[in-house]
């Protein structure tokens, strides 16, 4: 009797279990009682990444330089092109369809994780003992200057945005 289900890498059509086309190939004709499934390789600018019965291959993704994109990995007949962003930019989504400039960490915040082509800068507030007085996409919070190691004393306390101000020790004794 005609099958109602087929094995892995097969599909059911016209009461026949036909072989799926392998990745990198598209379906030209279904199998029949007397013939195999016929498949053809995808052209150079196309791909199919699964066992399939698609009659058209998918176009490789275009990494549009106008959107700040560049090719990270060229596509094959079995894989799509992978785009990444130019230096100083990162993807706006997982599929990386466009890029935006990396965020800078404002004064009072330092870089916890430097941005990559696919992730933005991660900032963190400078904890007590650390400061950042610049807006930067690279600089971490810096520690306050240690006045003691310079035989100096704190004349002005530091904040998360400013370093301490050191000054000479008062030599007058009470």
């Amino acid at each position: 009797e005609p099958p109602t289900a087929c094995r892995e890498k097969q599909y059911l059509i016209n009461s026949q279990c036909c072989s799926l086309c392998q990745p990198g190939q598209k379906l030209v004709s279904d199998c029949t009682e007397f013939t195999e499934t016929e498949c053809l390789p995808c052209s150079e600018s196309e791909f199919l990444d699964t066992w399939n019965r698609e009659t058209r291959c998918h176009q490789h993704k275009y990494c549009d330089p106008n959107l700040g994109l560049q090719v990270q990995q060229k596509g094959t007949s079995e894989t799509d092109t992978i785009c990444t962003c130019e230096e100083g930019l990162h993807c706006t989504s997982e599929s990386c369809e466009s890029c935006v400039p990396h965020r800078s960490c404002l004064p009072g915040f330092g870089v916890k994780q430097i941005a990559t082509g696919v992730s933005d800068t991660i900032c963190e507030p400078c904890p007590v003992g650390f400061f950042s007085n610049v807006s930067s996409a690279f600089e971490k919070c810096r520690p306050w200057t240690s006045c003691e190691t310079k035989d100096l004393v704190v004349q002005q306390a530091g904040t998360n945005k400013t370093d301490v101000v050191c000054g000479p020790q008062d030599r007058q004794r009470a």
Epitope: S19, V28, S29, T32, E33, F34, T35, E36
Partner: antibody, heavy 112, light 112 residues
Amino acid sequence: EVQLQESGPGLVKPSETLSLTCTVSGYSISSNYYWNWIRQPPGKGLEWMGYIRYDGSNNYNPSLKSRVTISRDTSKNQFSLKLSSVTAADTAVYYCARLDYWGQGTTVTVSS
Amino acid sequence: DAVMTQTPLSLSVTPGQPASISCRSSQSLENTNGNTFLNWFLQKPGQSPQLLIYRVSNRFSGVPDRFSGSGSGTDFTLKISRVEAEDVGVYFCLQVTHVPFTFGQGTKLEIK
């Protein structure tokens, strides 16, 4: 339902060309399948002559050398057989077939 | 070419009794994908061949379940579990794995 119907002259002179046409209804010959010509000499078995595929490409039985040509007319949903330089040995019932469906056959006699 | 040899060439069976026909190929009919394109046909007197079994063991639509096919590689069998009067005719095997397609010489089934 798929139906195939052979047509053509029943009598061909030796050395001439035998020409038959198969008209298909119920299925487009350019959709899929291989469209075959098969013959059966009187009192003998079946012999595959060749086919034309849904895409128009061919395959022929080498035993018929280069005497056989199968072509098609997709606008009429027909495919045709030409067999050149016939002899009495080509006298047979000629069938067109998709293999799951066959024409009723047409008898061709080669005689002067 | 794949030469197809059928045995026996004739068979006389009492209605209700089983019948078995063998078809042996001179080369394996299994292709590189592991599929085997061996088919069985019945040609009733005065008619075109009709498909019974395709791909070794698949019954074509409308074929009674008393017909079954089996085998692999080079050896194949058609079985009729209980022969009926309407089963008379010539049974052919046909391989379409290799070009040229080739038929067995036929087995004539008669009713006792």
